[in-house]
């Protein structure tokens, strides 16, 4: 009975999400393997988040709006481990918008989800950021490593979206 009611709840939750995400990829987790954590297909998952790499070239604002329509934001990177996971799926000759911007050009960087900007947990390439006119951040491969660079927000780039996992 308990299992039956849990399955019914899951199915109704899945139906609820199906109007937003036609397909979900779920894995069982939790100490009794009773919880399912899901990401939209074909998003990838790491820890408690889902990630989507958009190869559509768009401005930073349009990229953020695009993520938002999918229930996500441009990616907020909190740890080196998270960045290392993300970069496994990136092309080394491309650049991707992050959810990091400095709209006034005052070098007051801010994350799209209001996570406090911590200078100690940043991965800027050497010499970056370097221009008050370049108010949006990308991640790209330079000098044999992945890092961040400030760029013009209006210049179209690829992007990375991030959302919380869906638990059912």
């Amino acid at each position: 009975n308990f299992m039956y009611s849990k399955t019914v709840k899951r199915l109704s939750k899945l139906q609820e999400y199906q109007q937003y995400y036609p397909s979900l990829t779920c894995v069982m987790e939790g100490k009794d393997m009773e919880d399912w954590s899901c990401c939209p297909t074909p998003w990838t998952s790491f820890q408690s988040s889902c990630y989507f790499i958009s190869t559509v070239m768009q401005s930073w604002t349009k990229s953020q709006n695009n993520c938002s329509v999918m229930g996500a934001d441009l990616v907020v990177i909190n740890t080196k481990e998270e960045q290392d996971f993300i970069t496994q799926n990136l092309k080394i000759n491309s650049a991707y918008f992050l959810g990091l911007s400095d709209p006034k050009g005052w070098r007051h960087w801010q994350w799209v989800d209001q996570t406090p900007y911590n200078k100690n947990v940043t991965f800027w390439h050497s010499g970056e950021p370097n221009s008050p006119d370049e108010r949006c951040a990308i991640i790209n491969f330079r000098s044999e490593e992945w890092g961040w660079n400030d760029v013009h927000c209006h210049v179209p780039q690829k992007s990375i979206c991030k959302m919380k996992k869906i638990y059912i």
């Epitope: 768009q58 401005s59 349009k62 709006n65 911007s101 709209p103 008050p132 006119d133 927000c153």
Partner: antibody, heavy 121, light 111 residues
Amino acid sequence: EVQLVESGGGLVKPGGSLRLSCAASGFTFSSYGMSWVRQAPGKGLEWVATISSGDSYTYYPDSVKGRFTISRDNAKNSLYLQMNSLRAEDTAVYYCARQLYYSYGYYFDYWGQGTTVTVSS
Amino acid sequence: DIVLTQSPASLAVSPGQRATITCRASESVSFHGTHLMHWYQQKPGQPPKLLIYAASNLESGVPARFSGSGSETDFTLTINPVEAEDTANYYCQQSIEDPPTFGGGTKVEIK
């Protein structure tokens, strides 16, 4: 006082080349992105090329891509537009304009008086 | 590319009256309260001159009879009251995304 003075325009045959210059004064040229904007006779404004302050970024519309090259010499406070394989439809007044960034975009806050390019056989 | 459509293409206004020009973008040029639409005036034989930036901000030295409003895709430039010296072409321009694009222009004549 901010001043932008274009030169180098003239009459050229189709397929020919021309190099436009824009001399900037009255501001720290190296700190600003710059653009070329053109206006065909009796027509509206059409953006032609952009270069970032540090020369790291250039951008062109499809109509001139591969034919026009924007460049700058910050030591000389000068902006250039090299125009090759010119066509009749490139006939226009060419303005150089300074970009001022605002939030996620920019606007053109100062314009030169323009230089006229005529492409005709 | 973002297409900007200005209307009307031309208008004639009597001195002291109000002139209203609209600019419609093919997609939003706004983001979180910032509207990246700008307005320029071009008098015959002269280069364009910045009037309004970011939809509603009056450029320094521009008379207060010029004002701008709007958001997302619909923007308006208003001249009130119109003076004889306002005879010119007026252009809108967006900068939220490359390439920067201009509207086709509106010719304002004073009756």
